[in-house]
């Protein structure tokens, strides 16, 4: 029961995590205009992995896609790649884990196969979560670096009469969604790996056991009698562990001239 619960919970947690990774990847708020200790503007800028947006105080929002591939910073491309790899691995992991779930019967799939699939999906979830966390962290690091660079520029002499205020960007909601989602996927993956240990048949449990009959010496090995209660092919489906018994079970909106905020 505990194996099923661990596996099921791992699946659900990973599913939520991957949904979060997808959401974070599609979100526009990876970086948002820093409003603290900055000249306050009537325009709010925010950027995602795929497009940048501007929201006016009028309520008008305009988003523009990054229609270039070569002109984008290498770091942004790297973050995109990490997030996509995370999503792909997570999606495959989910697919594999569905078939690995103990509560789902697929033909005569043996527990050893389910254990392997559970482990595979667990590893995929772990890598997926790590990819998301890495992607978000790389982007966050990029923001921190740019933030302090633009802060330095703001306070050094510009020269000339005209001041230009550089827009500084800080962490957007997508970063926090990404971190949490990556963490959940990672936790789900670990849970799947733990569940895998409970599914794997313990070969040392029932090695050849000799029964000495009074008249002649005959060795009965597991699998010898299909109808036997403790042995036979059933051993693969029923396992007893030291820990206790376990049984099966992501534009534009336009304000109308007649519609005001």
């Amino acid at each position: 029961m505990a194996v099923t619960a661990c596996q099921g919970l791992g699946f659900v947690v990973s599913l939520i995590g991957i949904a979060g990774i997808i959401a974070a990847t599609c979100m526009d708020q990876w970086s948002t205009q820093d409003l603290y200790n900055n000249p306050v503007t009537a325009v709010f800028n925010y950027q995602g992995l795929w497009r940048s947006c501007v929201r006016e105080s009028s309520g008008f929002t305009e988003c523009r896609g990054y229609f270039t591939l070569l002109g984008l910073p290498a770091m942004l491309q790297a973050v995109r790649a990490l997030m996509i790899v995370g999503i792909v691995l997570g999606a495959i992991g989910l697919l594999v884990s569905i078939f690995a779930l103990k509560c789902i019967r697929i033909g005569s799939m043996e527990d050893s196969a389910k254990a392997n699939m559970t482990l595979t999906s667990g590893i995929m979830f772990i890598v997926s979560g790590l990819c998301a966390i890495a992607g978000v962290s790389v982007f966050a690091n990029m923001l921190v670096t740019n933030f302090w660079m633009s802060t330095a520029n703001m306070y050094t002499g510009m020269g000339g009469m005209v001041q230009t205020v550089q827009t500084r960007y800080t962490f957007g909601a997508a970063l926090f969604v990404g971190w949490v989602a990556g963490g959940l996927t990672l936790i789900g993956g670990v849970m799947m790996c733990i569940a895998c240990r409970g599914l794997a048949p313990e070969e040392t449990n029932y090695k050849a056991v000799s029964y000495h009959a009074s008249g002649h010496s005959v060795a009965y090995k597991p699998g010898g009698f299909k109808a036997s209660t403790g042995f036979g092919s059933n051993t693969k489906n029923k396992k007893i562990y030291d820990g206790g018994a376990r049984t099966e079970d992501e534009v534009q909106s336009y304000p109308s001239k007649h519609d005001y905020v």
């Epitope: 000249p39 306050v40 325009v43 105080s57 309520g59 523009r64 230009t164 827009t167 007649h258 905020v261």
Partner: antibody, heavy 117, light 113 residues
Framework: QVQLVQSGAEVKKPGASVKVSCKAS???????VHWVRQAPGQGLEWMGE????????NYNEKFKKRVTMTRDRSTSTVYMELSSLRSEDTAVYFC???????????WGQGTLVTVSS | DIVMTQSPDSLAVSLGERATINCKSS????????????LTWYQQKPGQPPKLLIY???TRESGVPDRFSGSGSGTDFTLTISSLQAEDVAVYHC?????????FGGGTKLEIK
């Protein structure tokens, strides 16, 4: 027809307060409404803005201590109250509705406030 | 605060001639996010509220005659009336719609020569 209709002219004594109203008709009362004043023969001066949806407001620092902007959603009316009036507050006060580019597409007809002892 | 400096203070132009009004801001009004300049032009006739002519420095408001055009970027902007008509006699104001507090230029009085 889109209209912002303001209250009538007021004559106030120095130190008093004035409350000017701006009633919106012809459109949904949801967007920021701004207040701008114009002293006789002078340029335009932005005083602040109010969001009728949530009553959030932003004020020009120059008027922050003296101005209060409120709204009554039931009557689609916004109010601008200016306290501690001085003679230099004599001006025409306009309310304006915001549009693309944070520009002011619709204006009230203006309310003349005269501060005189 | 952002200072908006309009020039000239007053301008006399013959009917049918070109009128040019300049506006300079103390900080750039260009928003890098959408590459739009948050500068607006208004026309104000005596005893009337201002009328929106141009927003985003060059986008003409619907119903505004095409003889009115706006140009410029960053800190320097221009309002041009290609062929002055009698009804264009008014005061023209430029406005910073980017930084709070939103500020206006001193106005340019346009008259017929």
């Amino acid at each position: 027809q889109v209209q912002l209709v303001q209250s009538g002219a007021e004559v106030k004594k120095p130190g008093a307060s004035v409350k000017v109203s701006c009633k919106a008709s012809g459109y949904t009362f949801t967007n920021w409404v701004h207040w701008v004043r114009q002293a006789p023969g002078q340029g335009l001066e932005w005083m602040g803005e109010i969001n009728p949806t949530n009553a959030r407001s932003n004020y020009n620092e120059k008027f922050k201590k003296r101005v209060t902007m409120t709204r009554d959603r039931s009557t689609s009316t916004v109010y601008m109250e200016l306290s501690s009036l001085r003679s230099e507050d004599t001006a025409v006060y306009f309310c304006a509705g915001i549009y693309y580019g944070n520009s002011f597409a619709h204006w009230g007809q203006g309310t003349l406030v005269t501060v005189s002892s | 605060d952002i200072v908006m400096t309009q020039s000239p203070d007053s301008l006399a132009v013959s009917l049918g001639e070109r009128a040019t009004i300049n506006c300079k801001s103390s900080q750039s009004l260009l928003n890098a996010g959408n590459q739009k300049n948050y500068l607006t032009w208004y026309q104000q006739k005596p005893g009337q509220p201002p009328k929106l002519l141009i927003y985003w420095s060059s986008t003409r408001e619907s119903g505004v005659p095409d003889r009115f055009s706006g140009s410029g970027s960053g800190t320097d902007f221009t309002l041009t009336i290609s062929s002055l008509q009698a009804e264009d006699v008014a005061v023209y104001h430029c406005q910073n719609n980017y930084y709070y507090p939103l500020t206006f230029g001193g106005g340019t009085k346009l008259e017929i020569k």
